[in-house]
Interface confidence: medium
């Protein structure tokens, strides 16, 4: 008789999840010499231990502490790029500007990027059928808690000038409910971080508005200023040209506003 299984609203665990995590770990540690000491089997065991046999709506940050410990990594604290709702461009940028880092350029972020996972209470099975949706089911699910945990730690580590890429095509350019708005903004350390610089990425080719004057950006400025951190904002009118100029800064067309 087939056992009754909880049907959640979100997609199930990503296909070949254990193999993907392990393979990514091996690849990452081969490419990054400073992480060569990491034992990927132990990393997978710690990752698995955070959610296997646990109710997928009852996961805590403590569940991920063994994984956090194994994945401890030092990135240059003044080279951090946060992003909100514009992941692909942020990643394209750090692929070119190799001395800057998004969360997904760190081991733990790289391991989990774009993946979904959850288990079931009291069984060692991974649930490939469905996992809890943050809105429809519960917020304390394995994926959401993981990203909350690593995002908080990443923001806490930042110093000097921190950059954040924001999507100017959204109705809420700064969204208080995003990971950036609800976690990272509140965990920047005022004693270490001097300035948060927002890069607002324009979507429309003919869009010449100053999106730094958007009410949600003003809200972000207010939150940041109250935390004794300076705020600055730049419009990136042409993201394609912006990337091109990061690749080839000597190009004559790169002196004009991007």
């Amino acid at each position: 008789v087939p056992r009754w299984r909880q049907q959640w609203s979100g997609p199930g665990t990503t296909k070949r999840f254990p193999e993907t995590v392990l393979a990514r770990c091996v690849k990452y540690t081969e490419i990054h010499p400073e992480m060569r000491h990491v034992d990927c089997q132990s990393v997978w065991d710690a990752f698995k231990g955070a959610f296997i046999s646990k109710h997928p709506c009852n996961i805590t940050e403590e569940d991920y502490q063994p994984l956090m410990k194994l994945g401890t990594q030092t990135v240059p604290c003044n080279k951090i790029l946060l992003w909100s709702r514009i992941k692909d461009l942020a990643h394209q940028f750090t692929q070119v500007q190799r001395d800057m880092f998004t969360l997904e350029d760190t081991l733990l972020g790289y391991l989990a990027d774009d993946l979904t996972w959850c288990g079931e209470f009291n069984t060692s099975k991974i649930n490939y059928q469905s996992c809890p949706d943050w809105r429809k089911d519960c917020s304390n699910n394995p994926v959401s808690v993981f990203w909350k945990t690593v995002s908080r730690r990443f923001a806490e580590a930042a110093c000097d000038v921190v950059h954040v890429m924001l999507n100017g095509s959204r109705s809420k350019i700064f969204d208080k409910n995003s990971t950036f708005g609800s976690v990272e903004v509140h965990n920047l350390q005022p004693e270490k971080v001097q300035t948060l610089e927002a890069w607002v990425i324009h979507g429309g080719r003919e869009d010449s508005r100053d999106l730094c004057q958007d009410p949600t950006i003003k809200e972000l400025e207010s939150i940041i200023s109250k935390r004794n951190i300076q705020f600055s904002c730049k419009n990136i009118y042409r993201p394609d040209k912006f990337l091109q100029c990061v690749k080839n800064p000597e190009d004559s067309s790169c002196t004009s506003e991007i």
Partner: antibody, heavy 121, light 112 residues
């Protein structure tokens, strides 16, 4: 080299069924989802559904529920689609296409050459 | 279902010049994870479709960098910087943010 080799053209009578195949080579069929897409003559593309060859789980466009049945034979690295109760509306070219990544909403990066189905009495 | 809208034909372009093909969706294709699940395919005459651009702006493997994709949540553009004879065909946009996945009607690239 990744290749998706589809079975040959089919001429079938209204009301009959047809089963077409898509043989994957150059990669492990269980590592990627397999999608099926319909293209009526001179028309656009219509997503029928996909199968996860690892466990046989399928996800179909509601429009093709009861019309298309997706299966896979892992041992021969072959995906199949059976179309039932055929009418002239089902006359089209049917493509199998591999899903680009490990997550269900990724693009289709390799396509078969297509199987032409003609329904005629 | 999300409806993808494309013009049936492009403005005729001369070889070596640039071309733009537009696509719009009835709903935003920007997922809460920050990724826009809009893909572009080219179907050359008598051939199967091939992936050109995935997730709005990423160039698929083996595709020349004359092709680029951009857009917002609902309006998208495929650009070809220097059109070549082999670029002739029908260009389809497709969304994969919400099932059922849907394709645009296709835009035929016209050469002058």
């Amino acid at each position: 080299e990744v290749q998706l080799q589809q079975s040959g053209p089919e001429l079938v009578k209204p009301g009959a069924s047809v089963k077409m195949s898509c043989r994957a080579s150059g990669y492990s069929i269980t590592d990627y989802n397999m999608h099926w897409v319909k293209q009526s003559h001179g028309k656009s593309l219509e997503w029928i559904g996909y199968i996860d060859p690892d466990n046989g789980a399928t996800n179909n466009n509601q429009k093709f529920k009861g019309k298309a049945t997706l299966t896979v034979d892992k041992s021969s690295s072959t995906a199949y689609m059976q179309l039932s109760s055929l009418t002239s509306e089902d006359s089209a070219v049917y493509y199998c296409a591999r899903s680009e990544g490990y997550q269900y909403y990724y693009a289709m990066d390799y396509w078969g050459q297509g199987t032409s189905v003609t329904v005629s009495s | 279902d999300i409806v993808m809208t494309q013009a049936a034909f492009s403005n005729p372009v001369a070889l070596g010049t640039s071309a733009s093909i537009s696509c719009s969706s009835s709903k935003s294709l920007l997922h809460s994870n920050g990724i826009t699940y809009l893909h572009w395919y080219l179907q050359r005459p008598g051939q199967s479709p091939q992936l050109l651009i995935y997730r709005m702006s990423n160039l698929a493997s083996g595709v020349p960098d004359r092709f680029s994709g951009s857009g917002s949540g609902t309006d998208f553009t495929l650009r070809i910087s220097r059109v070549e004879a082999e670029d002739v065909g029908v260009y389809y946009c497709a969304q994969m943010v919400e099932r059922p996945w849907t394709f645009g009607g296709g835009t035929k690239l016209e050469i002058k």
